[in-house]
């Protein structure tokens, strides 16, 4: 089931998967002077079993002017380039796909791509949030925002961050511990696929994780 | 290119069996998912089911759930669904596409006695 | 399963017009959607995908527009050559559906 909205958004922050749940879909769209080719796909999907998950399809991109070139990035597990855009920071390896069943890590850049990803995300799926550079974080619980399923309806929960502009960069996912209150994080709704195992594994990861590549819009 | 073709149509039986293939050229085969719908005569469309590109990720429609098998052979670039126990109301036109774009001719399958 | 309502299920209309076909789905889908084009006796054509981005290839006649559950596909000034089923079919979600179709006839 796909969220029917974007995650939440917080003044002065940015949100990142740090893995995506099976079924969550990746736009092929490609930079200004460039499109699609009729070869290439038109989304990547996150597939897989109990063991193992990928992304299918290949995204690739072409210029506009000329037809006959196609320039194209096969999705390489091992492969992590630089993506080169303003808003980005610094690129992770991601850890390893295996480390989180039923998930994808994030798909590597293909040539040409446009500037911001747009991912569709599933129920279940985690962000998590990190203060824009000069701004300082606040918890008041977990960085973070889960897409869940109540009453027939997809929302995001509400991540309990505050960044306040202190000249100061904190270190993703937050310098300070996340302080897991009652208050924190309303759950007295009933939530689907998300399961205590999904929270821990990738709240470990999380913390283990160097800054991540940041896009700013998700669809 | 991409280029879809499909065979394996034909008359058969209710009750009988039946499989399609689906060639596939133009494009890296072995990275994308596939699926098969299909179209009776002067009907709409029905998505009938899909396969990830490792085949680790398999869907169905409920109409064919536990008759059709869909699986594909990377290597040798071919999709292919296994059709059995057959009835009337699969008679229909079958094509192989992928991410909707890019469609096979098509291959009939015509369920009778 | 996401049900998609597609209209008119047909339409008689004259070279040069302009005509528009709507596709409803019963949830959101988030522009996920592929508008197609059956020629008789003929395959498929994907026309527009991701709700509005024209296919390479396909003339600017042809566009699409739309949101969370209501999508169309609009062709303007018609041509010979546009005489055709239309589908539309959502890939947001498992198991894909399509629309009925429209038939599109000459006046």
């Known amino acids: 089931e796909l969220c029917d909205d974007d995650p939440p958004e917080i003044p002065h922050a940015t949100f990142k998967a740090m893995a995506y749940k099976e079924g969550t879909m990746l736009n092929c769209e490609c930079k200004r002077g460039f499109r699609r080719i009729k070869s290439g796909s038109l989304y990547m999907l996150c597939t897989g079993n109990s063991s193992h998950s990928s992304w299918d399809n290949q995204c690739q991109c072409t210029s506009s002017a000329t037809r006959n070139t196609t320039k194209q990035v096969t999705p390489q597990p091992e492969e992590q380039k630089e993506r080169k855009t303003t808003e980005m920071q610094s690129p992770m390896q991601p850890v390893d796909q295996a480390s989180l069943p039923g998930h994808c890590r994030e798909p590597p850049p293909w040539e040409n791509e446009a500037t911001e990803r747009i991912y569709h995300f599933v129920v279940g799926q985690m962000v998590y949030y990190q203060c824009v550079q000069g701004y300082r974080a606040l918890h008041r619980g977990p960085a973070e925002s889960v897409c869940k399923m109540t009453h027939g309806k997809t929302r995001w929960t509400q991540p309990q961050l505050i960044c306040t502009g202190e000249m100061e960069t904190s270190q993703f996912p937050g310098e300070e511990k996340p302080q897991a209150s009652p208050e924190g994080r309303p759950e007295s709704e009933t939530s689907c696929l998300v399961t205590t195992t999904d929270f821990q594994i990738q709240t470990e990861m999380a913390a283990t994780m160097e800054t991540s590549i940041f896009t700013t819009e998700y669809q | 290119d991409v280029q879809l073709v499909e065979s394996g149509g034909g008359l058969v039986q209710p009750g009988g069996s039946r499989k399609l293939s689906c060639v596939a050229s133009?494009?890296?085969?072995?990275?994308?998912?596939m699926h098969w719908v299909r179209q009776a005569p002067e009907k709409g469309l029905e998505w009938v089911a899909y396969?990830?590109?490792?085949?680790?990720?398999?869907y169905y429609a409920d109409t064919v759930k536990g008759r059709f098998t869909i699986s594909r052979d990377n290597p040798k670039n071919t999709l292919f669904l296994q059709m059995t126990s057959l009835r009337s109301e699969d008679t229909a036109m079958y094509y192989c596409?992928?991410?909707?774009?890019?469609w096979g001719q098509g291959t009939l399958v015509t369920v009778s006695a | 399963d996401i049900l998609m309502t597609q209209s008119p299920s047909s339409m008689s209309v004259s070279l040069g017009d302009t005509v528009s076909i709507t596709c409803h789905a019963s949830?959101?889908?988030?522009?996920?959607i592929v508008w197609l084009q059956q020629k008789p006796g003929k395959s498929f054509r994907g026309l527009i995908y991701?709700?509005?981005k024209l296919e390479d290839g396909v003339p600017s006649r042809f566009s699409g527009s739309g949101s969370g559950a209501d999508y169309s596909l609009t062709i303007s000034s018609l041509e010979s050559e546009d005489f055709a089923d239309y589908y539309c079919?959502?890939?947001?979600?498992?198991?894909?559906?399509f629309g009925g179709g429209t038939k599109l006839e000459i006046k």
């Open positions: 596409a992928r991410d909707w774009m890019n």
């Open positions: 133009g494009f890296t085969f072995s990275t994308f998912g």
């Open positions: 396969i990830s590109s490792g085949s680790g990720t398999i």
């Open positions: 949830q959101g889908i988030r522009s996920n």
């Open positions: 991701h709700g509005t």
């Open positions: 079919v959502q890939y947001a979600q498992f198991p894909r559906t």
